[in-house]
Structure formats: structure tokens, C-alpha cells
Interface confidence: low
């Protein structure tokens, strides 16, 4: 599957990148789908996670593959191309002025990426502008070795950021999840994602989302009124991909946000979340870093109860057991807690209305020198029917103006040993966290404690 190397900004001539889409602007490259599919797909999905250092789990509790290990394996697998959609890059300790041994895994990853370029494997990175990591040199280092980097000006285009975190490798393998390209995501922040191997149909579908970012990364790009047909998705909530994952009948599709970055056939991220919630009959378990039934980045903030209402409706109207596990760290905005208490106040076991909210507090311990770390950064939801793994926090802006993706997977129980479906694996990981000593009920988390571990 040979991908022509896309031009970097320096090679792009203004005449090649008209500001107006009426004059035509095609993707930098198009996947050679027929060629890619000559190799038979044998899709496999592996849940991956990062557990912050010094956060021991109970012996024998379920776990997923370590994220750092999975990323290094994916890069070892690469033969032709690695495409990375990322919010920002900060893979080395000096990026943020920190000297800590826990940055070594990130530094090893950066080294591996440089080796990749040395092996003449194409690396294309779409990253956000504006960015969080203004002092990071990772992308300059990679660009100097031949990586193609485009900054996607989401601020100008939608008043948001590119918050996605996914990889497409050789048009066959995928990583997506909550982890940024940041060393802290590997050792200091709790993350959850998925790696899908040998699945060109899904990989090339996610590649189309990467392409939406790529074409918007040229100077003067504007959002098209209608995306050209070659960006369209054939997989969505009405027509998901059907395949065997390790022999298990599976349906899956990728969703995207904001709506302006959803070409024809692409399910909107919010719609995907609501559909998964709406189909639940037994339970909805969600683990998210932030939960605000408001806007977060517009002033004054607006009330936005869409997800809140869906959880309430499921619990109250259908007797679905709702559990919400929310991140709680030194940078958590305390104005979130009244909303969490309000949601939990709906709970009325006598009337078969079950809503429970806890916060997950990662003890800082002796890691206080590392800013913006020691927090549950996950963004996933699981029901008895489906698993949803996303890149968005739960407030309006992440669905209306910020670029993100979601993965919805459903596997059929019964065709394999109990406990093997993706949704069952994800439920076990959720319940491990929910029942751990780091998950604190709201009653035990009085305002003013500032998410400091009291253990």
C-alpha cells in the first residue's frame, strides 16, 4: 500500500491550495483500497491502558495491555506509513522543564519514530493549532528527519482544537483512545484506548477522518460546505462494519466531531454516544475526565443538558443502572461538582432509579513535580450491548467545535467463552476502577478537598 509522500507546507505553492473549496482541493493522497484489501483482513481488537506509576491495583484484578508497549509494537509493525492525529506532542521531559525518569518511555517512543523515518517509512502528523505544547520540539525533530507535519487551524475554522488521538498504520492497523502524544500519558496519567490490528476496512475508514484534518492543514483552507465524495464513510451507526474479530462476530464504526468534520455517512460523535446510551437496557457505565452539562469554552457558558438528560432518561425511564466515574485531579474545575451531585440526586433505589457518581483520585505521591498529570483522563462508556471509546470530554464544546473521534464496538456473546466480548472486557476494567480505593463517592468528596487523595 504505497502512499505518496504528502507535501509539507514549505513545498506547497499558494496556487495549489486555494482558500475556496469551490476551486477544488483534493486529499494529499488517496488510499489504494483494492490493493490494501488484497491481504485478507483478520481483525483483532486489544484494549490498552496506562496506569499511573505508584497506583497499585488489587492482586488478580483485570488489566489491559500497557499503552506504551502497544504503541512500540505498532511502530515495529509499520512497513510503509504511520499517520498520527494528535492534539499536541510532548514526548520528552525537557519539553516541560521536568527531569523525571518516568519520561523515558516517551523518549523511547520519539526515538522509535525517528528510527522509523530512517527506515524510509512515511510519517504524517496532523496536529492542533492552537496547541498546548508550545515549548515542545518533538515535531521539529521529526520534520527535520522527513516527517510531514500539518497544523490544523481548528481555532480559526471552528473555534475549537483538534483533540483527536489516533494512529493509522500501513492502512491496516489502528490506535485510538484518550492518550495524547505525551510522555505523561504513558506513565503519569490514567488512559484507555484500543488497538485494532489487521483491519484495513476500518483503518481506511478512519484514514478518511485523518484526511479531513490533512486537507484543512494547508494555509487558507476553509471548511467545505459539502465534503467531496472520497471522504464519505460507508460505516456508521446505521450500517456498521461487520466482521470477525478473533473469530467473534463484531460490528464497529467510527464517529467524529464536530459536525462540520463529518462527511456524508459519518456518524456524529454525540449521536453515537446517545445511540449507545439509548440502546442500553441493563447498565451504562462511563469513565470520563470531565462532565459538564454546559459549554466550557464560551463566555458566558451555556447550559447544555444533552448527555445529562440521556443518562437521566435511561435511569428514570428504563431502569438502567447508571454509573459515572469522573476524573479528579489538581487541575479539576470544582464547579463540576454541583452537576455531579445533581445527577446523583436523581437516584431512588426504592423506585428502581439507580444513578451513582464517583470521582477517581490518583494520589500525587512524590510526583508533584509533574504538572497536568495524576488524573483519570479516560473517555469511555460501556453498556451490556456496546463499548464506546472516545477522545472527547463530556461537555458541549467537545461535540460542537472540537475535533474528536469515537469508536463503537458490539460483539455477540455466546460465540466465545464468557468474558471475551469487548464490552465485557471494558465492563471489567470499569468495575475494577469503580470498586478500587481511588474511586470516592461524592459524599466523601466534600467541596474544598480539591481532589487531593485522602487515603
Amino acid at each position: 500500500w504505497q502512499v505518496p509522500r504528502p507535501p509539507t507546507w514549505g513545498q506547497v505553492q499558494p496556487k495549489d491550495v486555494p482558500r475556496s473549496w469551490e476551486h477544488g482541493s483534493s486529499p494529499a493522497w488517496e488510499p489504494l483500497e483494492a490493493e490494501a484489501r488484497q491481504q485478507r483482513d483478520s481483525c483483532q481488537l486489544v484494549l490498552v491502558e496506562s496506569i499511573p506509576q505508584d497506583l497499585p491495583s488489587a492482586a488478580g484484578s483485570p488489566s489491559a495491555q500497557p499503552l506504551g508497549q502497544a504503541w512500540l509494537q505498532l511502530l515495529d509493525t509499520a512497513q510503509e506509513s504511520v499517520h498520527v492525529a494528535s492534539y499536541y506532542w510532548s514526548l520528552t521531559g525537557p519539553d516541560i522543564g521536568v527531569n523525571d525518569s518516568s519520561s523515558q518511555l516517551g523518549e523511547a517512543l520519539l526515538q522509535k519514530l525517528q528510527q522509523l523515518l530512517g527506515r524510509n517509512i512515511s510519517l504524517a502528523v496532523a496536529t492542533s493549532s492552537p496547541t498546548l505544547a508550545r515549548t515542545s520540539t518533538d515535531l521539529q525533530v521529526l520534520a527535520a528527519r522527513g516527517a510531514h507535519v500539518r497544523q490544523v487551524p481548528m481555532g480559526r475554522l471552528t473555534r475549537g482544537v483538534l483533540h483527536s488521538k489516533f494512529w493509522v498504520v500501513d492502512g491496516r492497523h489502528i490506535y485510538m483512545g484518550s492518550a495524547n502524544m505525551d510522555w505523561r500519558s504513558l506513565t503519569q496519567v490514567k488512559e484507555l484506548g484500543a488497538v485494532i490490528y489487521n483491519c484495513s476496512h476500518l483503518a481506511q475508514d478512519l484514514e478518511k477522518t485523518f484526511q479531513t484534518y490533512w486537507v484543512l492543514g494547508v494555509p487558507k483552507a476553509v471548511l467545505p460546505k459539502t465534503w467531496p465524495q472520497n471522504f464519505s464513510s460507508h460505516f456508521n451507526r446505521f450500517q456498521p462494519f461487520h466482521g470477525l474479530f478473533d473469530g467473534v462476530p463484531t460490528t464497529a464504526y467510527f464517529s467524529a466531531s464536530p459536525p462540520a468534520l463529518c462527511p456524508q455517512g459519518r456518524t456524529r460523535d454525540l449521536e453515537a454516544l446517545l445511540a449507545v446510551m439509548g440502546s442500553a437496557q441493563e447498565f451504562i457505565y462511563a469513565s470520563v475526565m470531565e462532565y459538564f452539562p454546559t459549554t466550557r469554552f464560551s463566555h458566558p457558558p451555556r447550559y447544555w443538558p444533552v448527555l445529562d438528560n440521556a443518562l437521566r432518561a435511561a435511569a428514570f425511564g428504563k431502569g438502567v443502572r447508571v454509573r459515572l466515574l469522573v476524573g479528579c485531579g489538581l487541575n479539576t474545575d470544582p464547579t463540576m461538582f454541583p452537576y455531579l451531585r445533581s445527577l446523583q440526586a436523581l437516584s431512588n433505589p426504592a423506585a428502581n432509579v439507580s444513578v451513582d457518581v464517583k470521582v477517581f483520585i490518583v494520589p500525587v505521591g512524590n510526583h508533584s513535580n509533574i504538572p497536568f498529570s495524576r488524573v483519570n483522563h479516560s473517555k469511555f462508556m460501556v453498556t451490556e450491548k456496546a463499548a464506546y471509546i472516545g477522545t472527547s470530554n463530556w461537555s458541549e464544546d467537545y461535540f460542537s467545535s472540537t475535533a474528536g473521534v469515537g469508536l463503537v464496538v458490539t460483539q455477540s456473546p455466546g460465540a466465545q467463552p464468557a468474558g471475551a466480548t469487548v464490552q465485557e472486557q471494558l465492563r471489567q476494567l470499569f468495575e475494577r476502577d469503580w470498586s478500587s480505593r481511588y474511586a470516592v463517592g461524592l459524599d466523601g468528596q466534600a467541596p474544598g478537598q480539591d481532589c487531593v487523595w485522602q487515603g
Epitope: 507546507w9 508550545r134 497544523q151 487551524p153 480559526r156 471548511l223
Partner: antibody
């Protein structure tokens, strides 16, 4: 919020060149286009051109090609416009403007008077 | 280049009135339009971006609407500080082009 601070009033002779500046503060200077706009009384607003400081790409109104030259120094978060071969027609107020939606934030304007 | 036709060129109105200013583009501009305010002897202030969105700090009595090639700025319940010149600007493609302006005067 972005603030744009422009250089002061300029008085110049026909045939001369002048450079005016626009210093940005409050947001990442490299992530939005910086535009320059001309306003003459009774003549409406004319777009001169724009520069994308992130990679120094420029785009000019055909009318001002060869007349205006746009540059930017990212380390100083400052955009510059050099105006050459001045004539009386160049007497006007010149504004820099930028932001994620192109015309969100405006400088206070630089008045250029060309007189012999 | 896209021609932006703005109307009216001026209007005399009273405090408390509601006024609308329109801009017609010579082709569809997909809401890539901004509205600007300029007070006499002063610089410009962005009011609306992307057709309908208020810039930070702009009072909610200002609103924008429209689609395709036709857009409008409405000011409800005019206050004394609203008497100024107003311009539309399209930025769907380079070169950006401006409307000719509307002068709002006190009757």
C-alpha cells in the same frame, strides 16, 4: 483575547517608502492570518493582503502587489507592512486585523500622510 | 472577487428601535461573514463571526443571521453607543471583500 498595537502616525514624501508595524499579544501569533486593510474617507475598505506568520506565506490583493510587502517576526509577535513608491493616493489609515475568523481583532490604525 | 452589496447606506433611527442591515454576496459564502462596527475617528470592533456568533464581550442585543448569499445584522433596542458605521466582510476566499458600510444616525 488578542490585542493588536500599531505604530504611530507617519508623514512622508512622494516616492519614499515607509514601514508600519503591528504587535500582537494575548494569543498564539503563528496560528491565524494577519490582514492589512486600507481606509480612505469616502472610499470604503480595501484589503491589501495577509500573512500567515506560522510559515510566512503571503497573499496580496492584485492592486497592491509591488506596492506593499508583508513580513512577520514570530519571535517578536509582530507583523510589518512596507509601502513603497508613495503617492498622494496612499494617504489613508491602515489597519492590521486578525484572529481565528480573520477579522476578529483590530489594531488602532496607523495614519499615513504623503505630502510634498 | 466576491462583491458584497450592503444596504442601506445610512439610516436614521431612534433609541430603543430595532434595526437590520443586510449584505448580499455575489455568490454563496457559506456563513463565512463577519460584521464590524466603527465609531467616528476610531478603529473597528468585530461584532459577529461566522454569520451568527457573537465575538467575546459583544452585547446580546446584536445578532446575525443568514445563509447562502444573504446575511443580516440586527440590533435590538438600540442604545446610544450603537450609533456608528457598520460593515460586513466575507472571508470565504481570498481576497476578502467588504460591504460599503451603513451609517446609523440618531433621528
Amino acid at each position: 483575547e488578542v490585542q493588536l498595537q500599531q505604530s504611530g502616525t507617519v508623514l512622508s514624501r512622494p516616492g519614499a517608502s515607509v514601514t508600519m508595524s503591528c504587535k500582537a499579544s494575548g494569543d498564539s501569533f503563528t496560528t491565524y492570518w494577519m490582514h492589512w486593510v486600507k481606509q480612505r474617507p469616502g472610499q470604503g475598505l480595501e484589503w491589501i493582503g495577509a500573512i500567515y506568520p506560522g510559515n510566512s506565506e503571503t497573499s496580496y490583493n492584485q492592486k497592491f502587489k509591488g506596492k506593499a510587502k508583508l513580513t512577520a517576526v514570530t519571535s517578536a509577535s509582530t507583523a510589518y507592512m512596507e509601502f513603497t513608491s508613495l503617492t498622494n493616493e496612499d494617504s489613508a489609515v491602515y489597519y492590521c486585523t486578525g484572529g481565528y475568523s480573520d477579522f476578529d481583532y483590530w489594531g488602532q490604525g496607523t495614519t499615513l500622510t504623503v505630502s510634498s | 472577487d466576491i462583491l458584497m452589496t450592503q444596504s442601506p447606506s445610512s439610516m436614521s433611527v431612534s433609541l430603543g428601535d430595532t434595526v437590520s442591515i443586510t449584505c448580499h454576496a455575489s455568490q454563496g459564502i457559506r456563513s463565512n461573514i463577519g460584521w464590524l462596527q466603527q465609531k467616528p475617528g476610531k478603529s473597528f470592533k468585530g461584532l459577529i463571526f461566522h454569520g451568527t456568533n457573537l465575538e467575546d464581550g459583544v452585547p446580546s442585543r446584536f445578532s446575525g443571521r443568514g445563509s447562502g448569499a444573504d446575511y443580516s445584522l440586527t440590533i435590538n433596542s438600540l442604545e446610544s453607543e450603537d450609533f456608528a458605521d457598520y460593515y460586513c466582510v466575507q472571508y470565504v476566499q481570498f481576497p476578502p471583500t467588504f460591504g460599503s458600510g451603513t451609517k446609523l444616525e440618531i433621528r
